[in-house]
Structure formats: C-alpha cells, structure tokens
C-alpha cells in the first residue's frame, strides 16, 4: 500500500509470522508506531511495535503463534494498519487488505550440510523451515556458489524448479575453499518473493590424487 511518500509492505512466512516494513519521508524518528493485524474471520488480532531500521523506515514482526502452526489459511484476508501515537490519540498512517498467500516470503533454508565431497564435485542438502504443508511439492529453489576471488553478486544462479532439497555441484576445482547458499520461493502468490539467502555453508574439495612416478 503506497500513500504519497509512504510505503507499507508486508510478507507472510506461510505459518505464523507476518513481517512488515513501513517507510515515510519526513516522519518523526521518535514517534511511537505499531502495526495492527485484524483477520476478517478469526477471533484474534495482533500488534507489533515498529522499530527504526533506517532514517525513514521501520520494521516489525507480527508473531501469530508458535513457529510451525498454521495461523492463516488461503482464504483469510487480514486488515493491516500502521498506527502512530499523536499525543493521547492514535492516527492511522497506512492500511492494506492483506491476502497472506498472495504475499509470501518463506524463511531462509536451514541445516545446510555437505553430504559427500570429492575433488570436482560436492553434494549438499538443506531443509526448509516453517513452510506450510499447503505447498506440497510446489516450491522452487535458487542456489549459488562462491568461488575464490569472486563476490556473491558474481556467482551464477542455479535454479531448481521443484522441491528438491539437495544439489550436486559439479566441475569444482580440487583442494579449493567454496561457500554455498540457497533460497526458496513458493509458486503461489502474485507478490510472493524469494526467501532470504541461507547462511553460507563453507566446504573444501578434496585434493587431486598425486600422479604416480614414472
């Protein structure tokens, strides 16, 4: 939802968390503001305190329940409001009718581990975290490998067009240090975006076998 120079963006992690960022040019830094969540067909509502993340933007997490509980469904609509204190009163600064499963951003994949490493290849696995059972297998992943002397931005993206929680990296250089990251995205949702990148996993390929003396 955008009002002039105000921007209010929220994402649902598919289970029990809605993360919101509100930015407004010229807003007072010391103003106390909150995000209020009112589902259209649930008995609960939730509030979180917006905390500054930069000069003109604030963020907060609406914790709806235990991390793996399915607190919202595909047909829920949540009214989200930014409310800021003005003296003794609260003023509404932004509002949106939020369809959780159209605005998804999952948690970063976790538990990355090297399953098997050789001189030129490495098999890596991971797990998805706090992802709804709704998705079944309809998720996709992006992965990238950091090579020596390069940056993450230069790393080519590898796309896995299905729910495949492992990858076999090929054509690696022997006895070389690498780092690996992965992120996940459901197919569902018009405004759905990629999860954050996972924590990097560092690994080293095995040295090449020494050639036999002739």
């Amino acid at each position: 939802a955008v009002n002039g120079t105000s921007r209010f963006t929220c994402f649902y992690n598919s289970r029990a968390n809605i993360s919101c960022v509100w930015s407004q040019d010229g807003a007072l830094q010391d103003t106390s503001c909150q995000v209020h969540a009112w589902p259209d067909r649930r008995r609960w509502n939730q509030t979180c305190e917006l905390l500054p993340v930069s000069q003109a933007s604030w963020a907060c997490n609406l914790i709806l329940g235990t991390p793996d509980s399915q607190k919202l469904t595909a047909v829920d609509i949540v009214t989200l409001r930014v409310m800021c204190r003005e003296g003794v009163r609260w003023r509404m600064m932004a509002i949106q009718d939020f369809k959780p499963f159209e605005n998804l951003r999952l948690m970063a994949p976790i538990s990355l581990q090297v399953v098997h490493v050789e001189t030129h290849r490495c098999n890596i696995s991971w797990k998805i975290s706090q992802a709804s059972h709704y998705f079944e297998r309809h998720l996709e992943f992006e992965a990238r490998t950091l090579s020596p002397g390069h940056t993450w931005e230069e790393a080519p993206l590898m796309t896995l067009k299905q729910k495949q929680e492992w990858i076999c990296l090929e054509t690696l250089t022997p006895d070389t240090q690498y780092e690996f990251q992965v992120r996940v995205k459901p197919l569902q949702g018009e405004f759905t975006t990629w999860s954050p990148w996972s924590q990097p996993l560092a690994f080293r390929t095995k040295p090449a076998a020494l050639g036999k003396d002739t």
């Epitope: 509980s69 399915q70 595909a74 047909v75 499963f101 709704y134 998705f135 079944e136 018009e190």
Partner: antibody, heavy 117, light 107 residues
Framework: EVQLVQSGAEVKKPGATVKISCKVS????????IHWVQQAPGKGLEWMGW????????EYAPGFQDRVTITADTSTDTAYMELSSLRSEDTAVYYC??????????WGQGTTVTVSS | EIVMTQSPATLSVSPGERATLSCRAS??????LHWYQQKPGQAPRLLII???QSISGIPARFSGSRSGTEFTLTISSLQSEDFAVYFC?????????FGQGTKLEIK
C-alpha cells in the same frame, strides 16, 4: 503411489442424508488437505469444500455451507463428506481429491449419488 | 463469485494439429488459474498450474499462457489420447470456481 478410493454408488430419497468415504494411501494424511467436488450433469464441477487435517479446520463453499459436513479419521486415513436434505439436483458424481488449497493434484474415482423418490 | 467462461464449448481438430482452448475470468485473478483434463468415466487430471507451470508427468505438448484475464491452453500436436474435456479453475477468490469445459473432439 498416491491413491484415493471412494465408497460405492448410493441411491437416496429426497430429504435424506448421504455420507461418502474416501480412503487414502501413499501420502501423509495427517499433513494433507482433502477436498470434495460435485459434478452434476447440468452444472459442471463445483468445489464443495475441504478439510485441513493438520490445522483441524474445514472450509465450505457458500453454496453448500448449510448442508455439507466434511470430517476425517486420521486413525484410518479416511475422509468423509456428508450431504443432508438431499434434493433431485444433488444427483451427481462426488469426488474427493488431494491438493494444496488452490488446485487438486490427485482425485478419487468418484461416487455416483442418485436422488430419486 | 468469479465466473470462468471457456470457449469454444466444442472444438474439432484433426490428430497431429494444434488445439487452442480459451478461458476467461470475470475479474482479475492474477495467475491463479489451473487446467484439468477429463476423459469419459474418469476423474479430472491436473495438467497446468498458475497459468503456465506444467505438472511433472504431463507431456511437453501441453502449455499454458495468460494475457490479462484471458488464459490459453495449447496442445501443440494432438495425440489420440488428448481428445477429452478440458476445464479451467480459478483459485484467486473463494469459492474457487471451474469453467463449464471445452470438449475437444476428433475432426
């Protein structure tokens, strides 16, 4: 292999209630959604509702809300759809299906219900 | 309730030729549109999800596309087993609704 096996054909009188079962195998029933769809001769496919076995919630389409009840028995991996106050226009094939909320990935073979006096 | 309108009601095409089936939504549904195939005496089978993503195990000759509220299912080279009824279904607003179907028959 994913399978959904439905109970047999039923003939009912107007005003009666029918209860159809859907026994599933090949996937984790406790973490799944089971949907029910009606296919009546003149009306095409109509989504009746679903049960979310993990969350323990049901969702019914407005057109069926006051007459349909969807339940599940997780001990036998079986879902049920009960339709009450039957009328002639309820004569149809009823399907159970598995899927996320948005589309139906696997279907049962269908159960024919005939409502006739 | 969103109304899904499929056209034509019946489409006659020769084997080996291309078939184009249309589905229009009565309001904007983003890419929340899915296609099914149904053969006589059988349950529907899911073919395409989110307008254009094909389901694993479905032949590559089936493809989907979208232009606004108009969605198209294309079968590039018809095989004998493709002659069936095709349904579209929206999942943008509950209750989710199906089109009335397009019957694809042998010319």
């Amino acid at each position: 292999e994913v399978q959904l096996v439905q109970s047999g054909a039923e003939v009912k009188k107007p005003g009666a209630t029918v209860k159809i079962s859907c026994k599933v195998s090949g996937f984790n029933f406790k973490e799944s959604l089971i949907h029910w769809v009606q296919q009546a001769p003149g009306k095409g496919l109509e989504w009746m509702g679903w049960i979310d076995n993990e969350a323990g919630e049901t969702e019914y389409a407005p057109g069926f809300q006051d007459r349909v009840t969807i339940t599940a028995d997780t001990s036998t991996d079986t879902a049920y759809m009960e339709l009450s106050s039957l009328r002639s226009e309820d004569t149809a094939v009823y399907y159970c299906a598995r899927g996320g909320p948005w589309f139906l990935s696997y279907w049962g073979q269908g159960t024919t219900v005939t409502v006739s006096s | 309730e969103i109304v899904m309108t499929q056209s034509p009601a019946t489409l006659s095409v020769s084997p080996g030729e291309r078939a184009t089936l249309s589905c229009r939504a009565s309001q904007i549904i983003s890419n929340n549109l899915h296609w099914y195939q149904q053969k006589p005496g059988q349950a529907p089978r899911l073919l395409i999800i989110y307008g254009l993503q094909s389901i694993s195990g479905i032949p590559a000759r089936f493809s989907g596309s979208r232009s606004g509220t108009e969605f198209t299912l294309t079968i590039s080279s018809l095989q004998s087993e493709d002659f069936a009824v095709y349904f579209c279904q929206q999942s943008n607003n509950w209750p989710y609704t199906f089109g009335q179907g397009t019957k694809l028959e042998i010319k």
